[in-house]
């Protein structure tokens, strides 16, 4: 009989319900923005904005300072007071729309929904390892700003993204704001602008460059700015916007906008459509060619990648890659595929595609009918003409005007749909050793830390844990402070180590020591932990074998039993080859001789299931007693595997030595032709792994085996005669003298 060890699901080696408590701060209101600062003298801070208040936290998330940022018109508003005696505009709550660092000074800049979206500059004052905010400077010059021309109106109540870039002796604010007709009419924020912060911090320089959604499109064409970042020579904005100015405004897609970070100009403003898809390995009937589109970007982050992912993406290690989490629609509702997918766009490739798009538009021969695009920002035109013009004039250049690149950049889900029902709401990517890890927050308040790798059919988790009990969504913006990431959920800020919150969710020694080196996991006798959790017995170099099951559960006291042991950490080599003398199995007092692996029985095990099998031949010693006993596997002197060596003993109860007894055989005669159905009755007849009924030395074919009964069909007899009948269990004869009489047919 060919018994096989039951497969253990890979998930059984970890427990994602393990509770981890990470440092947190209660902000007293829904967290609206968060940013971190690390100085060059070991001072650091976390700035957390809620409605009408700005908190300054130390690196330990303890409150250092708190500043009232609203309501506007309230005498207690500390930022408002910096603008001198009011009134400065309609009273109302201040929701923080922008919270960024100007690292050159260094200073914190906060901009709110009140007071025409003006900003405040807070110089940073290091105090030991903490940081305080100096009295705020109001970045607003009343006599410089009018409703139709307001360089100091930065934040839109509908949302604003800002990236600060230092150019020469100045800080430039790259600002992208969502607009509608009402917002645009009130102190005229722009869709995209580059504003220089004046050296005296009195506001922003006038006459700044900007693009804005044209008034006729403001009602129907809204752009959501999801993320902004600066890398290399460019600043990038990521948007979700209608795919067309003229078609259904609810048909959305994602774009990347690129601006020069070295020149405060918008002539080389470029947009590129980002296309992220889920392409299952086996395509369902009716599924779209090229995969199911996930057009709406939810969150994004750019980071340099580790060696392994770089190889898979065919780029160099350390190159910057834009990662985006995409959903099928605004509500991110369930579709056929997963709820969220993750696509990777190497920055160099993005830049190349954009540059090629510019060549297509501006280098002859230009494809007839190729549009410059961005008709929501500028007058329609065909390449190579400038916006709104029929032809290029001699003193203008095709390249000096904004352009939508005519091709899109298409990518497929890195996780092959494995995120399944998870709705990702936050993303931050880090490189740890040569591994690239995605730290994701979810709609139900969990953190998933997963290796970014595309060649697998399962997720490689660093961790998967709940941030707290509230189950509120993790917010979009994530900040890094040293070796920690700061996530916000509801009114709380949580500090999560980038190496993961701990190791207790790994349940087996093998899984524990196979964890990434950066996690610092080790085995502490019976649990996985970090060294500080169990200094006594903590080690990272070996695991004992682990017996989970064996078969059979009983064997004859005389005769041999082929014992199959199941578990993990038997070999550490896929071939399952065992060096001589390393594995010792005893059952009770009796040795069990290791058997060579039958290569014909080796079969591939999918990585998401795992089990190891070990076979041995059990021959009880003469001194072995009947009754229950233990199975013990000891492994010593094994050569080390990739992650650890196997060393130690595992013991499992539940084996019994039994003595089979044959009590009755009937009928005691039958035709010489054979085929008589013999019934053998007794006790413990099914023990062990082999048994044979011999009629005159020839095997009687077993039809049924149970503990108390064997059924077999007699073989043909040579002559009419009484012949010996015997029962062997495990190759040893069961006591008793029985005969069977062959008669004429």
């Amino acid at each position: 009989e060919d018994w096989q060890c039951p497969r253990t699901p890979y998930a059984a080696s970890r427990d994602f319900d393990v509770k981890y408590v990470v440092p947190s701060f209660s902000a007293g209101g829904l967290v609206q923005a968060m940013v971190t600062y690390e100085g060059d003298r070991n001072e650091s801070a976390v700035f957390v904005a809620i409605r009408n208040r700005l908190h300054v936290l130390g690196p330990d998330l303890k409150s250092v300072q708190s500043l009232a940022t609203g309501p506007a018109g309230d005498p207690g508003c500390q930022t408002c007071a910096a603008c001198g005696p009011g009134p400065h505009g309609p009273p109302g709550d201040t929701d923080t729309k922008v919270l960024v660092l100007d690292p050159a000074l260094p200073a914190l800049v906060s901009c709110g929904s009140s007071l025409q979206g003006r900003c405040f500059l807070h110089d940073l004052e290091p105090q030991g390892t903490a940081v305080h905010l100096a009295a705020p400077a109001c970045l607003f010059s009343a006599h410089h700003n009018r409703p139709d021309d307001c360089p100091d109106c930065v934040a839109s109540p509908l949302g604003t993204r800002v990236t600060v870039v230092e150019q020469g002796q100045a800080s430039y604010f790259y600002v992208a704001s969502s607009l509608d007709a009402a917002v645009a009419a009130s102190f005229s924020p722009r869709s995209v602008s580059i504003r220089r912060l004046k050296a005296d911090a009195s506001g922003f320089a006038p006459g700044f460059v900007a693009l804005s959604v044209l008034p006729k499109h403001l009602v129907s064409y809204s752009i959501e700015y999801v993320h902004s970042f600066h890398t290399g020579a460019f600043v990038y904005f990521l948007t979700v916007q209608p795919a067309s100015v003229t078609d259904d405004p609810s048909a959305l897609h994602t774009r990347l906008a690129r601006l020069s970070a070295t020149e405060p100009e918008l002539g080389d403003y470029r947009e590129l459509v980002l296309d992220c898809r889920f392409a299952p390995k086996r395509r369902r009937r009716g599924a779209p060619e090229g995969g199911q589109p996930y057009p709406v970007l939810r969150v994004a982050h750019s980071a340099p990648v580790g060696a392994q992912l770089a190889t898979e993406l065919s780029i160099a290690e350390g190159q910057e890659v834009l990662f985006g989490v995409f959903v099928t629609g605004k509500d991110g509702g369930p579709g056929v595929g997963p709820n969220s997918v993750v696509c990777a766009f190497p920055i160099d490739l993005l830049d190349t595609l954009i540059d090629e798009g510019v060549e297509r538009c501006c280098e002859s021969p230009v494809h007839p009918g190729l549009r410059r695009g961005l008709d929501f920002f500028q007058s329609p035109s065909f390449c190579p003409n400038p916006p709104g013009l029929e032809a290029l004039s001699p003193n203008t250049s095709c390249r000096h005007f904004p352009l939508l690149v005519s091709s899109s950049f298409s990518r497929v889900d890195l996780f092959n749909g494995l995120l399944g029902p998870v709705q990702v709401t936050a993303l931050y990517v880090t490189r740890l050793d040569n591994v690239t890890v995605a730290h994701m927050g979810t709609m139900d308040g969990r953190i998933l830390q997963v290796e970014l790798v595309r060649s697998l059919n399962y997720l490689l988790y660093v961790s998967n844990f709940s941030l707290g009990d509230s189950g509120q969504p993790v917010q979009r913006d994530v900040s890094r402070l040293g070796d920690h990431l700061l996530f916000a959920s509801g009114d709380q800020v949580f500090q999560v180590p980038i190496q993961g919150p701990g190791c207790r969710h790994f349940l087996t020694c093998g899984r524990c020591l196979r964890a990434w080196h950066f996690m610092g996991c080790g085995w502490c006798g019976n649990m996985c932990g970090q060294q500080k959790e169990c200094p006594g017995s903590w080690q990272q170099d070996h695991c004992p074998p682990k017996l989970t099951e064996f078969h059979p559960h009983s064997g004859p006291l005389r005769g041999s039993t082929r014992l199959t042991l199941c578990g993990s950490n038997f070999y550490l080599h896929p071939s399952g080859l065992v060096p001589e003398g390393t594995h010792q199995v005893t059952v009770g007092q009796s040795p069990c001789r290791p058997l060579p692996k039958d290569s014909s029985k080796l079969r591939p095990v999918p990585r998401k299931d795992f089990v190891e099998e070990f076979e041995c031949e059990l021959e009880p010693l003469g001194t072995q007693a009947v009754g229950p006993t233990n199975v013990s596997l000891t492994v010593t002197n094994m050569p080390p595997g990739k992650h650890f060596r196997v060393d130690g003993t595992s013991v499992l109860r539940g084996f019994s030595f039994m003595e089979p007894v044959l009590i009755a055989v009937q009928p005691l005669f039958g035709p010489r032709a054979g085929g008589t159905c013999l019934t053998l009755e007794g006790q413990s007849l099914s023990v062990g792994t082999s048994r044979a009924v011999l009629v005159n030395g020839t095997e009687c074919l077993l039809a049924r085996v149970s503990e108390g009964q064997l059924l077999c069909a007699t073989p043909p007899g040579a002559t009419v005669a009484s012949v010996p009948l015997s029962l062997q269990v495990g190759g040893a004869q069961v006591p008793g003298s029985w005969t069977f009489q062959y008669r004429e047919d």
């Epitope: 050159a104 000074l105 260094p106 200073a107 110089d123 940073l124 004052e125 100096a134 010059s141 006599h143 410089h144 020469g168 002796q169 100045a170 220089r196 004046k198 050296a199 005296d200 320089a205 006038p206 006459g207 700044f208």
Partner: antibody
Framework: EVQLQQSGPELEKPGASVMISCKAS????????MNWVKQSTGKSLEWIGD????????RYNQKFKGKATLTADKSSSTAYMQLKSLTSEDSAVYYC?????????WGQGTLVTVSA | DIQMTQSPASLSASVGETVTITCRAS??????LAWYQQKQGKSPQLLVY???TLAGGVPSRFSGSGSGTQFSLKINSLQPEDFGSYYC?????????FGAGTKLELK
Amino acid sequence: EVQLQQSGPELEKPGASVMISCKASGYSFTGYNMNWVKQSTGKSLEWIGDIDPYYDGTRYNQKFKGKATLTADKSSSTAYMQLKSLTSEDSAVYYCTREGRGFAYWGQGTLVTVSA
Amino acid sequence: DIQMTQSPASLSASVGETVTITCRASENIYSYLAWYQQKQGKSPQLLVYNAKTLAGGVPSRFSGSGSGTQFSLKINSLQPEDFGSYYCQHYYGTPLTFGAGTKLELK
């Protein structure tokens, strides 16, 4: 390339007025304040004031209020400083310099000599 | 007004030496401080801004440090072209003020 070209040296009698010019090129003139700085022979530097060419807004060091008047002509990208009621104390090199966190761009300086 | 006190007023040094010039503000100016070099008959040249950021084209032997009220400019391995006058200046509000200067001479 950012350049600030100042007018040539001036020899004036006490009580007279003088107008110094500073022509800017290589950048958006209205996007930056223009500052003026005085340096007397063998002495340190003194900030006189600045002008915002976009709005024509001016700020002065209290010490130079009534002495200096700053103006700007957007059409020619030129900033001007007029010094009134000159005395020997006003003899100095006067520099225009473009706003920034630190003054990275300076004119070559205009020497004003007040002598009877 | 914020006063900027610079020391020493003059300094003699040899090529290859390291020198440090200090500047003290009468009140907290955070990092809103610039350093300039001026040669005889020339316009000042920006060396350092934001207290410690080197301006474009300035050799790395120059370095600025400090914040709040105490600042310094350090020149490692003096070169012949480094001799001249040095000024600190704050730009934290108006009026902007300069230090009285340090004259660095060849010993």
